[in-house]
């Protein structure tokens, strides 16, 4: 008897436990900026404060007709998600509501921003525990929108925000492209991309993961104890915002890098059917959708990783882009992608006293994505050493010189444009263990980590034959913190991580022109963190 | 994301005719102004003013009090909304668009962002 | 088929606690789909909400009387409790338990009281 | 909170005849309302539920209608059984039931 979305997000180990606590004594507090709530219903009753905060614009037409109802319809429903008493995913959980949209669910960025600023001003007021901001609301990008997330969330509060409705690319629709904020994707009962009449989920990079966003039993503002069907990606962002208030009902001290990585490792991976999305959003949108994760003391100190991409470049000849990791994060390597394959490589660079991942693009390239591998490495020292492009048929070593530094990752920049006289780079770990091994024009880039406990290792897969991509995955207990790829034939489109994974794609034509002995491989670098060892790199 | 994707800045740093006090023309606009891509979501009269993030309180209510008075002089009436002081230094002001070009070259601004709709999801 | 039954002392004192027990049979009181209610009617008069619970404990009270009730419930025991605080001549009234339908599942039933216990009568006297 | 206000008090009929009892809510309760019926020293029974849908074993003689702040209960031929308090009750906002009508034998 318990609804299939709650069913899909708590394991049944967590099921007991909530049982335990029925009104939680959690100072998690959640903020909805949202339509008006009922704060008279039976799911909600006692654990919401409606605020007096009212900005929203008028509503459209002479003849519009306010109900209270239907005005309280959208809030009420996401505020029984959250916390309802019966279909709540954080039963018990205090919410306090601000009213930033109408009755017909229109708002304005000035009035979100207003709204933020509020809750920042009741935190400078009355600080109080950790705080969870629900944004189930879209506009187009607003760069304030997203500034003022940034600003707010750097001062502890965690933002999740829905992806957006409109079957498109998330990073168009704010607060949704703030990378600050958990980003939410719908997905149904069968765990798969939620259509809504024409239009649907939003996609793609800025989706940190999805949720059930489809048919979601919740609060009805018709009666103080009607329930009713709601579908969107608000209703998925609410999930998650339940799931991390309860994360920090256990855990008050998590980060928001902490709590994203946790929901990210944690998620149910590769149940979507990523067809569903556009051709060229597959590989950038994930493949997760959120259950509530153990807490950190069941599961030790993991290494957490995950893989953040960097807008497309445009096509210019100079074009670059670059990924940026979280501040708590390490970027621990960058990789490179183009669809064309005609890209430049990869490289790691400081700008502003953070370590960020660019990839450049080569001309006639369509484009390049910049591939960031950010980790969470309690007490971590990370340092990158280069070396320029070595002379004519001269390889380029780099290894990591520093006692006790691991190798994580290794990224190639190319210095010559022209794709066909340059032999792409290589990683060997038979023959030099923990060194980066680039080609004729390649300067080399190498990840060097020293954390306690850290330990890593090189695992390759070849494949000789046609094949459009070559995969490789790190065993149990190890996390891929570095990808790349090893060409035999002239051309390949790069290399990225997905999840554990390390996947590195050959161009089509590539697969033709390709003779036995030319293997392509898949180099991932496997760490794990063992606070009992100290750092080494594993043969 | 940190690139603006599908988004509209609009450089407005053209020198007005009547901008003929030295403080005024001392000061070549930077600032640039946005707006949402969607051309129905927009809201055209009102602007969030963005200011440096260093720029301290009573800066920004001057600012907005130097937009006032620039406007008054050109026969225009601005109403400031509200300012942002806690999360973000600038101001919301009801004004044309006309002023937009005045208020871009007003020390302290990094950008004018045109208010727009956000929708329930 | 599901039958309610309250119990308690018919006498309680002015400023003392009315305390009451209703024990549920042919059904559990665990399950997930129900709420279990307190309804009173002072002799001669109309019927008055008190307060609803669920199984896992959580409560929603009427809110002229949330200050002085407290309701909880003993799922290994299959009942459910009132207490009703410092009590005057007003609370004499036949308490009555009930079901309730959640209506998280709308398959449950209607979503009102039904079925009801029998009443007890409790008297506020010195 | 919402009151509902039960008309007339006291409904004096014979058996076979109609029934017409009304409830008015002092604002709308849409269709969430409920009608009990309660016979001397007995718990309430439900009736109707939602305005107009007849709870299991009830009657086809009883019906109800309404929706907003008007709701009606008809008993389409009465039943020396049928002769008892009837009460309604809202759902719109917390709970609340309305003050009773009895249906006396004339």
């Known amino acids: 008897s318990i609804p299939w979305n709650l069913e899909r997000i708590i394991p049944a180990w967590h099921q007991t436990e909530e049982d335990r606590s029925p009104d939680g004594s959690s100072q998690v507090e959640v903020y909805l900026l949202d339509t008006s709530i009922q704060g008279a219903h039976r799911e909600i009753e006692g654990r919401v404060t409606i605020t007096d905060f009212n900005s929203v614009p008028e509503e459209d037409g002479t003849r519009f007709h306010r109900q209270a109802s239907k005005c309280d319809s959208h809030g009420t429903h996401l505020a029984g998600v959250v916390s309802g008493r019966d279909a709540g995913v954080a039963k018990g959980t205090s919410l306090h509501s601000l009213r930033v949209l109408n009755c017909q669910g229109k708002g304005t960025v000035s009035g979100t921003l207003i709204g933020l600023e509020f809750i920042r001003k009741s935190q400078l007021i009355q600080p109080s525990g950790p705080l969870v901001v629900l944004l189930p609301l879209a506009g187009g990008y607003s760069r304030i929108l997203n500034a003022a997330c940034r600003h707010l969330a750097r001062t502890g509060v965690v933002l999740v925000a829905a992806a957006g409705n409109f079957r498109d690319d998330a990073c168009l629709y704010s607060p949704a492209s703030a990378p600050e904020v958990i980003t939410v994707g719908a997905t149904n009962a069968q765990d798969q991309p939620v259509t809504l009449g024409t239009l649907g989920t939003n996609f793609g990079r800025c989706v940190d993961l999805f949720a059930p966003g489809k048919d979601i039993i919740g609060a009805s503002s018709d009666c103080s104890t009607c329930f009713m069907s709601q579908s969107g990606t608000s209703q998925a962002a609410a999930h998650v915002a339940g799931i991390v208030a309860r994360m920090l009902s256990r855990e008050p001290t998590l980060t928001l890098a902490e709590l994203r990585q946790r929901l990210i490792h944690f998620s149910t991976k590769d149940v979507i059917n990523m067809a569903w999305f556009p051709e060229d959003q597959q590989v950038l949108t994930p493949n997760l959708v959120a259950t509530l994760p153990p807490s950190t003391h069941e599961t030790g100190g993991q290494l957490l990783c995950r893989t953040v991409w960097s807008a497309h470049s445009g096509p210019t000849r100079t074009a670059t882009a670059t990924a940026r990791c979280a501040p708590e994060e390490e970027l621990l390597s960058c990789s490179s992608f183009s669809r064309s394959g005609r890209r430049r490589g990869d490289w790691i660079e400081a700008i502003g006293g953070q370590q960020v991942c660019k990839a450049l693009n080569a001309f006639g390239g369509e484009g390049v994505y910049a591939v960031a591998r950010c980790c969470l490495v309690p007490r971590a020292n990370c340092s990158i050493h280069n070396t320029p492009a070595a002379r004519a048929g001269l390889e380029t070593h780099v290894h990591c010189h520093q006692k006790d530094h691991v190798l994580t990752g290794c990224s190639f920049h190319w210095e010559v444009e022209d794709l066909s006289v340059r032999r792409q780079p290589a990683l060997r770990s038979r023959r030099q263990p923990g060194q980066c091994v680039g080609h004729q024009a390649a300067s080399v880039y190498a990840s060097c980590c020293h954390a306690p406990g850290l330990e890593c290792k090189i695992k390759e897969h070849g494949i000789s034959g046609p094949s459009e991509q070559v995969t490789v995955a790190c065993e149990a207990g190890w996390t891929l913190t570095g990808c790349n790829v090893l060409p035999g034939a002239s051309l390949t489109l790069g290399a990225y991580s997905v999840d554990n994974l390390c996947v590195a794609r050959v161009h089509d034509t590539a697969r033709a022109d390709r003779t036995s002995g030319e293997a392509t491989v898949a180099a991932a670098i496997c760490c794990r963190s063992r606070p009992s060892a100290k750092a080494s790199w594993v043969q | 994301q940190d690139e603006d994707g599908d988004y509209e800045e609009l450089m407005l740093a053209l020198p007005s005719q009547e901008d003929g006090l030295a403080d005024e023309a001392a000061h070549v606009a930077t600032a640039t102004f946005r707006r949402c891509s969607k051309e129905a979501w927009r809201l055209p009269g009102t602007y969030i003013v963005v200011l440096m993030e260093e720029t301290q309180r009573l800066q920004i209510e001057q600012t907005a009090h130097r937009l006032q008075t620039r406007a008054a002089r050109r026969g225009y009436v601005i109403k400031v909304l509200h300012i942002f002081y806690d999360l973000f230094p600038g101001f919301l002001v009801k004004m044309s668009s006309d002023l937009l070009g005045l208020a871009l070259k007003l020390p302290h601004v990094e950008y004018i962002e045109e208010d727009s709709f956000v929708f329930a999801q | 088929q599901l039958q309610l039954q309250e119990s308690g002392p018919g006498l309680v004192k002015p400023s003392e606690t009315l305390s009451l027990t209703c024990t549920v049979s042919?059904?559990?009181?665990?399950?997930?789909?129900?709420?279990w209610t307190w309804i009173r009617q002072p002799p001669g008069k109309g019927l008055e909400w008190i307060g609803s619970i669920n199984y896992r404990g959580s409560t929603y009270y009427n809110p002229s009387l949330k200050s002085r009730v407290t309701i909880s419930v003993d799922t290994s025991k299959n009942q459910f409790s009132l207490k009703l605080s410092s009590v005057t001549a007003a609370d004499t009234a036949v308490y009555y338990c009930?079901?309730?339908?959640?209506?998280?599942?709308?398959?449950?039933?209607?979503?009102?009281?039904?079925?009801w216990g029998q009443g007890t009568l409790v008297t506020v006297s010195s | 909170e919402i009151v509902l206000t039960q008309s007339p008090a006291t409904l004096s009929l014979s058996p076979g005849e109609r029934a017409t009892l009304s409830c008015r809510a002092s604002?709308?309760?849409?269709?969430?309302l409920a009608w009990y019926q309660q016979k001397p020293g007995q718990a309430p029974r439900l009736l109707i539920y939602?305005?107009?849908n007849r709870a299991t074993g009830i009657p086809a003689r009883f019906s109800g209608s309404g929706s907003g702040t008007d709701f009606t209960l008809t008993i389409s031929s009465l039943e020396p059984e049928d002769f008892a308090v009837y009460y309604c009750?809202?759902?719109?906002?917390?709970?609340?039931f309305g003050g009773g009508t009895k249906v006396e034998i004339k």
């Open positions: 009750q809202q759902r719109r906002n917390w709970f609340t």
């Open positions: 042919g059904g559990s009181i665990g399950s997930s789909s129900y709420y």
């Open positions: 939602d305005a107009s």
């Open positions: 009930a079901r309730e339908n959640s209506g998280v599942v709308p398959a449950a039933g209607p979503n009102w009281f039904d079925p």
């Open positions: 604002q709308s309760v849409s269709s969430y």
